[in-house]
Interface confidence: low
């Protein structure tokens, strides 16, 4: 992008930033009129995120970013996120000393919970390279929720599609058997956790996204909010990810993709997640932003504050 264009863009994004009361969480809606004059959304961003259409079945207004970082990283629309926007600093300070407060919220929508279970089952089926039948899925959903099956399946399919890049495909139009189509080109992420199995590797990009959108550090509570949206709960073993808490606080930390640190002088101790050195070495904020844009069917411009930060990082790195 020419220098003059970059500085104009930056000035425009600064104006947007001034309107953005809660940094990174309550991202203002980008209207279609604004969109036309935002060159970043058509020509400057590599990776084709800009041309991506909204993920099937996700009811979003044009270019609206989800209201929480967790919702953005999970690729769910703002209407579905459990929490409304909060002051970023307030959320940091109010966050509890342990993740336990945020997990298994008793008031959580049971359909969301069921779709989480279905995602878990579908990922397991994908992992063992087996097709899945409607009957098997109905068993997971249970008799009580059978009438809500279409809605639950739709939610599960969205989660599967936007986070893991897997599409459920009917074997024939009238059939009750589904296979999986892997629609994401892994070349972008091949260095990230290349020795890990597919679904676990796929969690890393959105986790990095949650951290980035939360001002480059995310509390345990914020991370669990995101994982809960995928049907992954603290203290509950997951058939694909194993022990989620171990995955995020041990495996990814030991592999240097995440840092897990005590919030300075917090008493009782509170913990936060940061990007680790390998995350900085093997991906970038811009790539993560493009990923988030892709899963939300929008463009990096929908996250103006973060787009500006990512641009600065690219410039520093001489990209």
């Amino acid at each position: 992008m020419p220098r003059g264009q970059k500085s104009k863009l930056r000035a425009r994004e600064k104006r947007r930033k001034a309107r953005d009361e809660t940094r990174g969480l309550n991202v203002p809606q980008v209207t279609e009129a604004e969109e036309e004059e935002a060159p970043c959304c058509s020509s400057s961003v590599s990776g084709g995120a800009a041309s991506s259409s909204p993920a099937a079945g996700i009811p979003q207004e044009p270019q609206r970013a989800p209201t929480t970082a967790a919702a953005a990283a999970a690729g769910v629309s703002s209407t579905k996120s459990k929490k409304g926007a909060k002051s970023h600093q307030g959320e940091k300070n109010a966050s509890s000393s342990q993740a336990s407060t945020s997990t298994k919220s008793p008031s959580e929508d049971p359909l969301t919970r069921k779709s989480g279970s279905l995602v878990q089952f579908l990922l397991y089926k994908y992992k063992i390279k087996k097709s899945v039948t409607k009957g098997e899925m109905l068993k997971i959903v249970g008799k009580r929720f059978r009438e809500h099956f279409p809605e639950i399946l739709k939610k599960a399919s969205e989660g599967l599609s936007v986070v893991f890049g897997l599409e459920l495909n009917k074997v024939n139009p009238n059939g009750h058997t589904y296979t999986f189509i892997d629609k994401v080109d892994l070349t972008d992420e091949e260095s990230l956790l290349s020795s890990w199995d597919f679904p676990r590797r796929k969690l890393l990009m959105p986790l990095l996204g949650v951290i980035f959108l939360n001002g480059n550090s995310a509390t345990e509570e914020e991370i669990w909010e995101f994982l809960n949206m995928l049907g992954v709960y603290d203290g509950e073993e997951h058939s694909v990810f194993g022990e989620p808490w171990k995955l995020i606080t041990k495996d990814l930390v030991q592999e240097k993709y995440l840092e897990y640190k005590q919030v300075p002088s917090s008493d009782p101790p509170r913990f936060q997640f940061l990007w680790g050195p390998r995350a900085y070495a093997e991906t970038s904020k811009m790539k993560v932003l493009e990923f988030l844009a892709k899963v939300n069917g929008t463009t990096p411009c929908a996250f103006p504050t973060h787009y500006e930060e990512a641009l600065k990082d690219e410039e520093k790195a001489g990209v």
Epitope: Q98, G235, E236, E243, K246, V253, E255, K261
Partner: antibody
Amino acid sequence: QSLEESGGGLVQPEGSLTLTCTASGFTLNNYYICWVRQAPGKGLEWIACIDNVNGRTYYASWAKGRFTISRTSSTTVTLQMTSLTAADTATYFCARSLSTPLWGPGTLVTVSS
Amino acid sequence: DIVMTQTPFSVEAAVGGTVTIKCQASQSISSYLSWYQQKPGQPPKLLIYRASPLASGVPSRFKGSGSGTQFTLTISDLECADAATYYCQSYDDSSSNNFFYGFGGGTEVVVR
């Protein structure tokens, strides 16, 4: 889902023994598997753990050198024990940890001449 | 190795009463502490992990608290079925490479 220990029994002092922990209904890929022992009428004592994601092994300071933990397949982890003495007589448990633990019923190892 | 000191060694209480068990770590383990219940001839059963969250299926009569080096398990509205030996267990802080998975000496709870 379950874990089961095998390989326990009577062994002579200074002898060796290998215990096996077998997982049913899941693979060990994403977990720590740990060995813990309990002498008759005594408390629990940690021996060693293996992180099956990366193969890293961890030992209690007293267990280093005499005990070796290793993964032998996607569903089995072994504990090799050497130079056994009467003090090693105990029920040996394998456990999947940490916040979603699963314990086997234990296998009794008796060191006696 | 980190030393876990559990007190008391044994405690007796009536049905409906309350029992408090303390566990002290020789150095800070942040919130990396679990509580287990063990009955004779059985493997230990997890009650609480990471200092305070209840494991699945554990009644809310069991409460864990504390952080750093001092931890407490409180059992209220005691039932006969709560008679058992209770162990605290620490595990490593993932920000260090020192993995530790050690147990306290155990506390026998007698319900009369």
